[in-house]
C-alpha cells in the first residue's frame, strides 16, 4: 500500500472551488462582544460569521481544515473569576482544588500501579514463549533475528528491564556473546515503546485529542525505529558499540556498587505485590534452556525461603554428565551422580491474591491484563477529565507558556536539550521510560504538550531508562557485572547515536513528522491505530522470525524485494511531491492503482460492516459509563457522553450536516449555542484557579 | 522385615519357558528396583537385568537381553523373570535381590530358584 | 563391559590371623565396588558398599579398601564362621559385573 494513503485524492488547490478559502477564519468567540447574564453567570453569546459557500455537499465530501489540527487547543475558562467569589465560595474553590490533586495524584499512582500490573500479566501470558525465544542458536549468527526477538520478547513481557536481565545473564553464563545481544538491546529499546502507544489508544474517544495523543506517542516509536534501521547496519559493519563499550568497561576499576536506587518502587512495590508477585527468574531459566524452568510457574508463592546446600544422588543421562568419574555409579537402571544441590526450604507464602488459587499461569494472566488494562482505561480517562477541570484559564496559559516555550534568542536551540535532560531525570525518577512516556501521553493528547516538547522528553527519557540500567548493572554481582555494565552501555550509546542522528537538526527530526502522518491518518480511520500497533509490533517481527528460521537465503529472498519495493514507493512519493514534473503523467498520483491500494477508504468500509454491530451496544455502555463518571466528578450537565460514539458523530457527517466535534477545553457553552442549545453551566461545579 | 519370596526348583524340558517369581513383602514393593542374578558353578555370579516396579522400567545385560523378560504386578508386589528357549546351559540358580534407587549393591536376596533344564 | 578379576580362587588362613582378598577391575571405577560373602548352600550377604563402607551388622574385622582399580577386602582375626566364598561386585556401569570369587578355607 501506498504511504500516506489520503493524499491522492486532495483537491490540489482549495481556493479554486471554495470562495474564500484562504481568508475564512477559525470559530472562535470575540471576547470584546457582549454577554448577556443570567444568574450571576457568564454565558457567551457569540456573533460569528460564515463565509458562503459554493456547494456544501463539496465541504463535507472534501473537509478543508483550516485550523493547523496540531495547534494546541485554547484552554478556556468557563467558571466564575477569582475576585469575583465571596469568601465561601474561595474557601470552596481552595478545597476544591486540593481534592482534585489528591485525586489526580491517586489516579496517577493507580495508573502507574496498573502499568506495573499490566508487565506482570504479559509476562504470565507470554513470558514462557518470550524466554524459549531466546533459546534459538541462530541469534549469534543472524543480527536481525536477534532485533525481532528483542522485540517481540519485550513486546511480550511488556517490560525492556526483564528482556535485557535475560540477555544480561546469558552474556553472564556464555550463552550469547555481547555482539550478540547488542541487536537484542535494540529489539527491546523499539518492544518498550508499546506501551505509551497501548496507553494512546486509550483517548480514542476524541478525534483531536486522538491525533495529538497516538502521533505523541508514535514519535518514541518511530524514533526507535528508525535509529535501529540506521545503526544496526551499522553496528553489523564496524561494531561500534561493541569496541567503544568494551573500552569504557576495560577502563573501569571494578568494585560493586550499593544497589540502584528504587525510587517509585518504593512506592508502588506495597500495592503491587499484593496483586501478584513473579518468580521472574523462571523466563531467564527458559532463555537458558533449563528444561525443569518449564513446568515451573511464574506467580511466586513463597516468598521467604531458607536456602540449603546438601550433597544429592541425582540421575545423569551419561556418565559424561558425571560431577567427577569418582562419584559416578548405576543401580542397575539408571546412571547416579552425587551434585551439591542447594535445597530450599519453604517458610512463609507470598500475601497475594493469586497465591491460593493454584491457577495456571495463562489463566492469572488473562485474569491480570483484563482488569489492569481496565483500570489503567479508567485512571486514564479520570486523570485527562481532572487535568482538563484543573488547567483552565491563566494556570493553563503558565503550564503552557512554561512547558512549550523556548528560551530567550539565541538560546532558543538549548530548550530541546534541557527537554531531553528533564526527560532523562524524570525517567530515572520513575525508573521506568514506559511509566514516563505513558503519563506523557495523556498531556499530549489534552494539549498540555506539543509533540515538539515530547519528542525530546521522550528522548530523554530513553536515556534515563539506561542510566538506571547502568546503575543497576554497577549493583549487580562480580560473575555478571561486565557483562551487564557492557550492556548497559551499548544500550546507552545506542539511543545517544539515535539522538544524535535524528535530533540536533531540525531537519532531521523524521519521527516528529511521521508521527504527525500517522496521527492524522488515526484520527480519520481510528481502527489503523490498532492495525499498526498489530503490523510494526508483533506481525512484522514474526515474519522475520519466521523467514529467519528458515535460513538466509529465504530471509534475503523475500526481504529483498520487499525492502525494493518500499526504497520504490518512497521515491516516487518523494518525486510526486517535491519534482512532479520529472515523472510521467500517470506516476504522478497513485490514481494508477486500485483505489484499496492507495486509499483507507474502502478498507474503512469494510471494517465498518465488521464492527458496526459491536458499535451500539459499546457505545450506549460508554454513555452510561460517561454519565456515571459525570456524577461522580460534579462536571457539569453538558458533558459530552455522546463524544465516544461514533455513529452519532459519522452518522451527520453522512447526512450532509458538518459535525465540529467539540475539543476538550473547547467553551462548551458556545458548542451548543452554535447548536442553538444554550445551557449555562453549574457555577458549583466550576472554579477557576487563579 | 524384608523378605524376598522364590520358588524352591523348576524342572523344564529342553526348548520350554520358565517364568519364576519372586514375592515381596515388609517393604514398599515400587521404591526399590529389583535384580536378578545367576549363578552357576562354572560361571559365579552374573548379573541379568533389573525393573524398577514403580515404572516398569527394565534394564537388561546385553547377554540376557534375549533369554530373559522382565516384569513386575505392583497389586501382587511380585516381580517375575521369564527364561525362553531354555537350553543346559540355563540351568543355575536365579536370585532376585532388592536395590533401592541410587543403589547399585543387592542387600536382600530372596533364596534363589534352582532351574534344572533336563529331558 | 567392566571385567572384575579376583586373582585366587583359594585362599587358606587360620583362626586368628589376618588375610586379605583382592580384586582387580579392568577400568577405573572409582569407589564403587561392593563385597558379598556366600555361604555353602546360602545366598550371597553384603558385607562391604562403596569399597569401605560397613552394611549394617556386618562385624568390624572386615574392611574394606582401595579405589580406582584395586580393591581389598580384609578380615582381620579370621573365625571358623567365615570360611565362604567372596565375591566383589562393581556397580560402576551397566552391565554390573562380579567377580569369580575367592573360597577362603581355614586351615
Known amino acids: 500500500m501506498a504511504p500516506w494513503p489520503e493524499l491522492g485524492d486532495a483537491q490540489p488547490n482549495p481556493s479554486k472551488y471554495l470562495e474564500g478559502a484562504t481568508s475564512q477564519q477559525p470559530i472562535t468567540p470575540d471576547k470584546s462582544k457582549e454577554t448577556n447574564k443570567t444568574d450571576n453567570t457568564e454565558v457567551p453569546v457569540t456573533k460569528f460569521e460564515l463565509l458562503p459557500t459554493y456547494s456544501t455537499a463539496t465541504l463535507i465530501e472534501e473537509p478543508t481544515e483550516v485550523d493547523d489540527p496540531w495547534n494546541l487547543p485554547t484552554l478556556q475558562d468557563s467558571g466564575i473569576k477569582w475576585s469575583e467569589r465571596d469568601a465561601k465560595g474561595k474557601i470552596l474553590c481552595v478545597f476544591q482544588g486540593i481534592g482534585r490533586l489528591i485525586l489526580l495524584l491517586g489516579f496517577l499512582y493507580f495508573f502507574v500501579c496498573s502499568l506495573d500490573v499490566l508487565s506482570s500479566a504479559f509476562q504470565l501470558v507470554g513470558g514462557k514463549m518470550a524466554g524459549q525465544f531466546f533459546s534459538n542458536s541462530s541469534i549469534m549468527s543472524n543480527p536481525l533475528l536477534g532485533l525481532v526477538i528483542g522485540v517481540l520478547v519485550t513486546v511480550f513481557v511488556q517490560s525492556s528491564s526483564t528482556s535485557t536481565s535475560i540477555v544480561v545473564s546469558m552474556v553472564a553464563s556464555s550463552l550469547l556473546t555481547v555482539r550478540a545481544a547488542i541487536p537484542i538491546i535494540m529489539g527491546a529499546n523499539i518492544g518498550t515503546s508499546i506501551t505509551n502507544t497501548i496507553v494512546a489508544l486509550m483517548q480514542v474517544g476524541d478525534r483531536s485529542e486522538f491525533r495529538r495523543a497516538f502521533a505523541g506517542a508514535t514519535v518514541h516509536d518511530f524514533f526507535n525505529w528508525l535509529s535501529v534501521l540506521v545503526l544496526l547496519p551499522v553496528e553489523v559493519a564496524t561494531h561500534y558499540l561493541e569496541v567503544v563499550t568494551q573500552l569504557i568497561v576495560e577502563s573501569f576499576h571494578f568494585k560493586n556498587g550499593e544497589d540502584a536506587p528504587d525510587l517509585l518502587k518504593v512506592i508502588t512495590k506495597p500495592f503491587t505485590k499484593l496483586i501478584v508477585q513473579l518468580d521472574k527468574k523462571v523466563i531467564s531459566q527458559i532463555a537458558m534452556n533449563d528444561e525443569t524452568a518449564k513446568n515451573k510457574s511464574l506467580v511466586k508463592i513463597w516468598c521467604k525461603t531458607f536456602t540449603n546446600m546438601t550433597q544429592m544422588n541425582v540421575t545423569v543421562p551419561s556418565m559424561a554428565n558425571c560431577t567427577s568419574p569418582s562419584l559416578c555409579w548405576t543401580d542397575g537402571i539408571q546412571i547416579w551422580t552425587m551434585k551439591n544441590v542447594t535445597y530450599k526450604e519453604n517458610i512463609a507464602k507470598c500475601q497475594h491474591i493469586f497465591v491460593n488459587f493454584h491457577l495456571p499461569d495463562l489463566a492469572v494472566g488473562i485474569i491480570l491484563l483484563i482488569i489492569s488494562l481496565l483500570v489503567l482505561c479508567g485512571c486514564l480517562i479520570m486523570i485527562v477529565k481532572i487535568l482538563g477541570s484543573v488547567l483552565k484559564g491563566q494556570v493553563a496559559t503558565v503550564i503552557k507558556k512554561t512547558i512549550n516555550t523556548d528560551f530567550p534568542f539565541p538560546f532558543a536551540w538549548l530548550t530541546g536539550y534541557l527537554a531531553i535532560l528533564v526527560g532523562a531525570g524524570m525517567t530515572f525518577i520513575v525508573q521506568s521510560s514506559s511509566v514516563f512516556t505513558s503519563a506523557l501521553t495523556p498531556l499530549i493528547g489534552i494539549g498540555v504538550i506539543t509533540i515538539e516538547r515530547a519528542y525530546p522528553l521522550t528522548l530523554g527519557s530513553n536515556i534515563g531508562t539506561t542510566t538506571t540500567a547502568i546503575l543497576a548493572a554497577l549493583a549487580s554481582p562480580g560473575n555478571t557485572l561486565r557483562s551487564s555494565l557492557q550492556i548497559a552501555l551499548c544500550h546507552f550509546f545506542f539511543n545517544i547515536s539515535g539522538i544524535l542522528l535524528w535530533y540536533p537538526i531540525p531537519f532531521t527530526r523524521l519521527p516528529i513528522r511521521m508521527a504527525k502522518g500517522l496521527g492524522n491518518i488515526s484520527a480519520k480511520y481510528r481502527w489503523f491505530a490498532i492495525f499498526y500497533l498489530i503490523i510494526f509490533f508483533f506481525l512484522i517481527p514474526l515474519t522475520v522470525f519466521g523467514l529467519s528460521l528458515a535460513g538466509w537465503p529465504v530471509l534475503v529472498g523475500v526481504g529483498v524485494p520487499v525492502v525494493f519495493i518500499i526504497i520504490l514507493v518512497l521515491c516516487l512519493r518523494l518525486l510526486q511531491s517535491r519534482c512532479p514534473r520529472v515523472l510521467p503523467k500517470k506516476l504522478q498520483n497513485w490514481n494508477f492503482l486500485p483505489l484499496c491500494m492507495h486509499s483507507l477508504k474502502p478498507w474503512d468500509a469494510v471494517i465498518s460492516k465488521f464492527t458496526g454491530p459491536f458499535q451500539m451496544p459499546c457505545c450506549c455502555c460508554c454513555r452510561v459509563c460517561c454519565r456515571v463518571c459525570c456524577l461522580l466528578c460534579g462536571c457539569p450537565k453538558c458533558c459530552r457522553c455522546s463524544k465516544c460514539c461514533q455513529d452519532l458523530e459519522e452518522g451527520q457527517e453522512a447526512q450532509g450536516v458538518p459535525v465540529k466535534a467539540p475539543e476538550t477545553f473547547d467553551n462548551i457553552t458556545i458548542s451548543r449555542e452554535a447548536q442553538g442549545e444554550v445551557r449555562a453551566p453549574d457555577s458549583k461545579t466550576e472554579c477557576t484557579a487563579l | 522385615q524384608v523378605q524376598l519370596q522364590q520358588p524352591g526348583a523348576e524342572l523344564v524340558k529342553p526348548g520350554a519357558s520358565v517364568k519364576m517369581s519372586c514375592k515381596a513383602s515388609?517393604?514398599?514393593?515400587?521404591?526399590?528396583?529389583m535384580q536378578w542374578v545367576k549363578q552357576t558353578y562354572g560361571q559365579g555370579l552374573e548379573w541379568i537385568g533389573a525393573i524398577s516396579p514403580g515404572s516398569g522400567e527394565t534394564s537388561y545385560n546385553q547377554n540376557f537381553k534375549v533369554k530373559a523378560t522382565l516384569t513386575a504386578d505392583k497389586i501382587s508386589s511380585t516381580a517375575y523373570m521369564q527364561l525362553s528357549s531354555l537350553t543346559s546351559e540355563d540351568s543355575a540358580v536365579y536370585y532376585c535381590?532388592?536395590?533401592?534407587?541410587?543403589?547399585?549393591?543387592?542387600?536382600?536376596w530372596g533364596q534363589g530358584t534352582l532351574v534344572t533344564v533336563s529331558a | 563391559d567392566i571385567v572384575m578379576t579376583q586373582s585366587h580362587k583359594f585362599m587358606s588362613t587360620s583362626v586368628g590371623d589376618r588375610v586379605s582378598i583382592t580384586c582387580k577391575a579392568s577400568?577405573?571405577?572409582?569407589?564403587?565396588v561392593v563385597w558379598y560373602q556366600q555361604k555353602p548352600g546360602q545366598f550371597p550377604k553384603l558385607l562391604i558398599y562403596w569399597a569401605s563402607t560397613r552394611h549394617a551388622g556386618v562385624p568390624d574385622r572386615f574392611t574394606g579398601s582401595g579405589s580406582g582399580t584395586d580393591f581389598t577386602l580384609t578380615i582381620s582375626n579370621v573365625q571358623s564362621e567365615d570360611l565362604a566364598d567372596y565375591f566383589c561386585q562393581q556397580f560402576r556401569s551397566i552391565p554390573l559385573t562380579f567377580g569369580s570369587g575367592t573360597k577362603l578355607e581355614i586351615k
Open positions: 577400568q577405573d571405577v572409582g569407589h564403587a
Open positions: 535381590a532388592r536395590a533401592a534407587r541410587a543403589e547399585g549393591w543387592f542387600a536382600y
Open positions: 515388609g517393604y514398599t514393593f515400587t521404591s526399590y528396583n
